[in-house]
Structures are given as C-alpha cells and as structure tokens.
Interface confidence: low
C-alpha cells in the first residue's frame, strides 16, 4: 500500500456547527487531513485512535473506505459528511467505537455510494429516526446502505433519557422506509428486552440478522413472514424460553434460511412440546442437538431433540377454591 | 455452485510485490466477510487478513500488517490480497475463505484451492 | 493476540479408534470455535464450527464439544479417510488465529 501522506494544515479545530456546513473548498487532488493516513491506490483513509472529536473536513474525494474508529466523536451532525464536490465514492463508514452519543437527523446524507456503516460500540443514546433516511418525509429517498453494524451501541443504563432504547433503533431503521435494500443487519449485545412487531416485515431485503446476546425473551409477536431472502438468524445468547408454533411455521417457510439458537433458557414444559416436535424435524436449525432445558430445575441440562411428550408436562393449575392469595 | 479460484500467484524476488485474486461464483457475494489464510511449505494454516461483506471493516495478522492490503470488488465478485516489500517468510500457498456467521462467531464454510508464492533471490 | 494451543501435535491410531483431539485457547472465546481437517496438497475442509455444530455433509462421527477455554475435537470411530491433519481456529477476537495442527496417522 502507498505510504501515508499528511496535510501540511494543522486538524480543523473550527467550531462545531461548521462541521454541519457543506465544505465549499475542493480537498487539494493529493490532500490527507492531518492524523490520518491515506492512500490513493486503495481509496482508503483511516483516521484511527486519534482522539478527533469531529469528522475531518478536508477529506479526500477518492475515498471509498473511510474509517473514523476509536475516536472521541461524541456527536455526527447533519450533514456530518457532506461536502464539495461529495464523496461520491465513499461505500464503506466505519465509526466503531469512537464514543458517538448522539446521531443526528441527515447525519450520512450526501453519501450516495454508501453501502456498508458499522456504528458498534457506541454509546448511542440520542440515535435520531431520520439518522439513515436524512428525511422526516413518510417516504424518503431509498438509502443505498446494504449492510449496516450495530452492534453494542446501548449507552449505560443512567443515559438512556427514560424511553425504550429498543424504539429508538427501530424508529432509525423504519424510518421513511430507506433502508428496503438492507441486506445484513447486526444488533447484537445491545440489551434488547423485545423487538417491535413490525420493524422486520419493513426490510424486506435482509439476507443476514443478527440479535445475539440480548435480551429477547420472546418473539411471538415477531413475523418473519416477509424475509422471503433470509439466510442466517443469529438469536443466541438472548433470555427465549420457548419459539412458539406461528413463528415455527415461518421459519420453516423461509427457503434458505439457518437459525442459530444457543444458549438460551428453555423451558421445557408443556408448552415446549411444539418446539421440541418441530426441531426433531426441521434443517433449519444449526447446531440443534445442543440446545438443552434450563427450566424447570427437574429438566435442567436435558437435550431437547431427546425430549418426549411424557418429559414436557405442565404443574396442574390450582382451582380458584384452592389458590391462595 | 460455490466456487472461489484464486490467481497472481508466483515467484517474486524479497522485497518484490504480487496481486493476488479470487474470483467467486454461486452465492450473494457482497453479502458475506471473505480471508486470506496462507500455509508454508509442512507448516501449517495462518489466517492473513479479513474483510467485511462491503469492505468497510479490514483485519490483519501482526506478521502482514502494513505491508499486505486486503479489498474486494463486489461489481466483479472478486477479493484482492496486494502483497508489497515480500519476505523469504511469506513463502506460502494462499487460500482464499468464504466467511459465514454472526458478531461472535464465525466460520470459513468454502475455500479456494490455493495459489503459490515463492519469494526467493 | 488469543493464542490456540493444540495438542497432540501427533497422533498415531488405526481404523476403529476412538480419537481425541483438544485444542486451549488464552483467554474465553465463548463457542466461537471451529476445526477443520486438511489433506496433503488439498484445501482445508471445514467439520465443526461454533464448537459443537457439525457442518452440513461432514459424517457424524465428528463432534465437538467445550466452551471458554478448552475444546475437543472427537472422532468416534476412525475411518480410513480420516487420516488428515486438523486445526481449530479460534474467531472470537478480530484476528482469527488457528492451532499449529495435530498430524492423524495410521498405527
């Protein structure tokens, strides 16, 4: 790869809202902000663990990949890279880990080659809806975005302004309905308790979902049914106690599908019998001979495709003349 | 049919430079992570380098860093490994890998044939 | 960097044998675990990845098992072609590191 090449001008040290402007000076052909590194033959900047605590505005207008990790960014204002001529080019945004708390509406607006963003490792407390759709009109220009990394970017438990911070990320993907071309989706560790019913029936392109260690415990009000092109679901690690027979039916009904269901806690009474039927059948499910019970203490460690209608039973429920209150 | 062939393979002089490329059939390309993992001769596999379905996001083993960049073209389906300033110990055939999985884990579920390098005055 | 250590790095065993082979990693790696088996002059072939699921037409005597540090790769009865040489590969860090191998020979 070519060596590094600096600008002789010192960081832009202007003032926060300038970096919301359009740059109306071109970047000089051979231009590279200081405390980054370029190179021309592979369109690529990195500007990686400098501490910026703003994008650079003279970046190049070669750059396909620009990569922004560990700095202390804080927050991406509208418009965050717009400039003059655009970075036409720029495919692939990395800003992981670089304390972002705050995405601002049009934040990636004027990026119109941008197929992949990975935002992880953020704590990002203020994501706002039109993040990705740079619009609040009820349809929006299509985002070019095919891949977009979201993993870990739950801000601590004191910083999340009292709303559900599972609302928040959805309102962003659903937003004017920019992201249909979306093809892989990475939410992982992001504390997710329950994922709104409607946000995947609105990304229709997805190949690849992954909601690994969260917090899910059930997806009975989740419908699969659209992702017609579905190829991997990633729901290890979450809270599931149980997959319900309408969510089973879907899966099932997905042609390329494989679902990734580890280390969750399944109860295995009852109501697990349908479960238990349909793992016993299915190829969807990788790795399935290793899903056991947790629950209840009796059944724990079992392994599920070993289970029979005898082992899967209910405690009688009390009638009302028996309960106590 | 999965398919990745793997090309630019060849003998190049210490401190020389090679392109290698592989070239991928039969599955939605840009929508999976690809590697390099080389193997010297009776030695055995070392991962070389990743990248993510769209590009945006590049791995390197320590003994590569700064000398081997990894890219990928999705309008052509192909994964490049820009080889510069070689060494005796880069000497290796270089297999290209299919990534398939998620956050935590991963796998190269289909794999090139590979492609020699030898590095030698 | 995680560091994977295999052991045996060789193994002489007939057809029939039960064989284990393990593989330690330096620090957790969850399940994000794989091995996979060579042959001279051929590319690797993925068995088992994310410790213990076997890979679409891989026989079913290869499993896998363990989690966190230690792992095991089993065949539960050696089969003529399965004389190889097999890696674990770790992929829980951003630098997928394999094992040095372990060489399977026939007795």
């Known amino acids: 790869s070519s060596s590094p090449t600096s600008s002789a001008s010192s960081f832009s040290s202007s003032a926060p809202f300038l970096a919301s402007a359009v740059s109306a000076q071109p970047p000089l052909p051979d231009q590279c902000p200081a405390l980054c590194e370029c190179s021309e033959a592979a369109r690529t900047v990195k500007c990686v663990n400098r501490n910026l605590t703003e994008v650079p505005t003279d970046l190049p207008a070669y750059v396909r990949n620009l990569f922004l990790t560990g700095n202390q960014l804080a927050v991406l204002p509208a418009g965050a890279f717009a400039r003059r001529p655009p970075l036409a080019e720029l495919a692939a945004l990395n800003l992981s880990g670089s304390r972002l708390d705050e995405v601002r509406a049009g934040a990636f607006e004027h990026l119109p080659s941008l197929r992949q963003l990975d935002l992880s490792h953020n704590p990002l407390a203020d994501l706002s809806p039109f993040a990705f759709s740079g619009s609040n009109a009820s349809v929006s220009a299509p985002s070019p975005l095919v891949e977009l990394i979201l993993n870990h970017i739950v801000p601590p438990e004191d910083e999340r302004q009292n709303r559900s911070f599972e609302g928040m990320v959805v309102a962003a993907l659903l937003a004017g309905r920019a992201l249909q071309g979306l093809r892989r989706l990475e939410l992982a560790s992001n504390h997710f308790l329950y994922l709104p019913r409607d946000v995947l029936a609105q990304l229709p392109s997805l190949r690849h979902l992954d909601l690994s260690n969260n917090s899910l415990v059930s997806l009975t009000y989740v419908s699969f049914r659209n992702l017609t092109h579905l190829e991997s679901l990633h729901l290890e690690d979450n809270a599931l106690k149980v997959l319900h027979n309408g969510t089973l039916a879907e899966l099932q009904g997905l042609p390329h599908i494989r679902v990734f269901l580890d280390n969750n806690p399944w109860v295995c009474d009852c109501h697990m019998a349908d479960m238990v039927t349909w793992l016993k059948e299915t190829e969807v499910v990788q790795g399935k001979d290793r899903l056991t019970c947790a629950y209840p203490e009796k059944m724990r460690n079992r392994v599920l495709l070993e289970l029979n209608s005898a082992d899967l039973d209910c405690d009688p429920i009390l009638p009302p003349s028996l309960q106590t209150s | 049919e999965v398919q990745l062939l793997e090309s630019g393979g060849g003998l190049v002089q210490p401190g020389g430079s090679l392109r290698l490329s592989c070239a991928a059939s039969?599955?939605?390309?840009?929508?999976?992570?690809m590697s390099w993992v080389r193997q010297a001769p009776g030695k055995g596999l070392e991962w070389v380098s990743a990248?993510?379905?769209?590009?945006?996001?590049?791995y390197y083993a320590d003994s590569v860093k700064g000398r081997f960049t990894i890219s990928r073209d999705n309008s052509k389906n192909t994964l490049y490994l820009q080889m510069n300033s070689l060494r005796a110990e880069d000497t290796a055939v270089y297999y290209c890998?299919?990534?398939?999985?998620?956050?935590?884990?991963?796998?190269?579920?289909?794999w090139g044939q590979g492609t020699l390098v030898t590095v030698s005055s | 960097d995680i560091q994977m250590t295999q052991s045996p790095s060789s193994l002489s065993a007939s057809v029939g044998d039960r064989v284990t082979i393990t593989c330690r990693a330096s620090?957790?790696?969850?399940?994000?675990l794989n091995w996979y088996q060579q042959k001279p002059g051929k590319a690797p072939k993925l068995l088992i990845y994310?410790?213990?699921s076997l890979q679409s037409g891989v026989p079913s005597r290869f499993s896998g098992s363990g989690s966190g540090t230690d792992f095991t790769l089993t065949i539960s009865s050696l089969q003529p072609e399965d004389f190889a040489t097999y890696y674990c590969?770790?992929?829980?860090?951003?630098?997928?590191?394999f094992g040095q191998g372990t060489k399977l020979e026939i007795k």
């Open positions: 890998a299919r990534y398939y999985g998620g956050y935590y884990s991963a796998w190269m579920d289909y």
């Open positions: 039969g599955f939605d390309f840009e929508s999976y992570a």
């Open positions: 990248i993510s379905g769209s590009g945006g996001s590049t």
């Open positions: 620090q957790s790696i969850r399940s994000a």
């Open positions: 994310a410790a213990s």
């Open positions: 590969q770790q992929t829980y860090g951003y630098l997928h590191t």
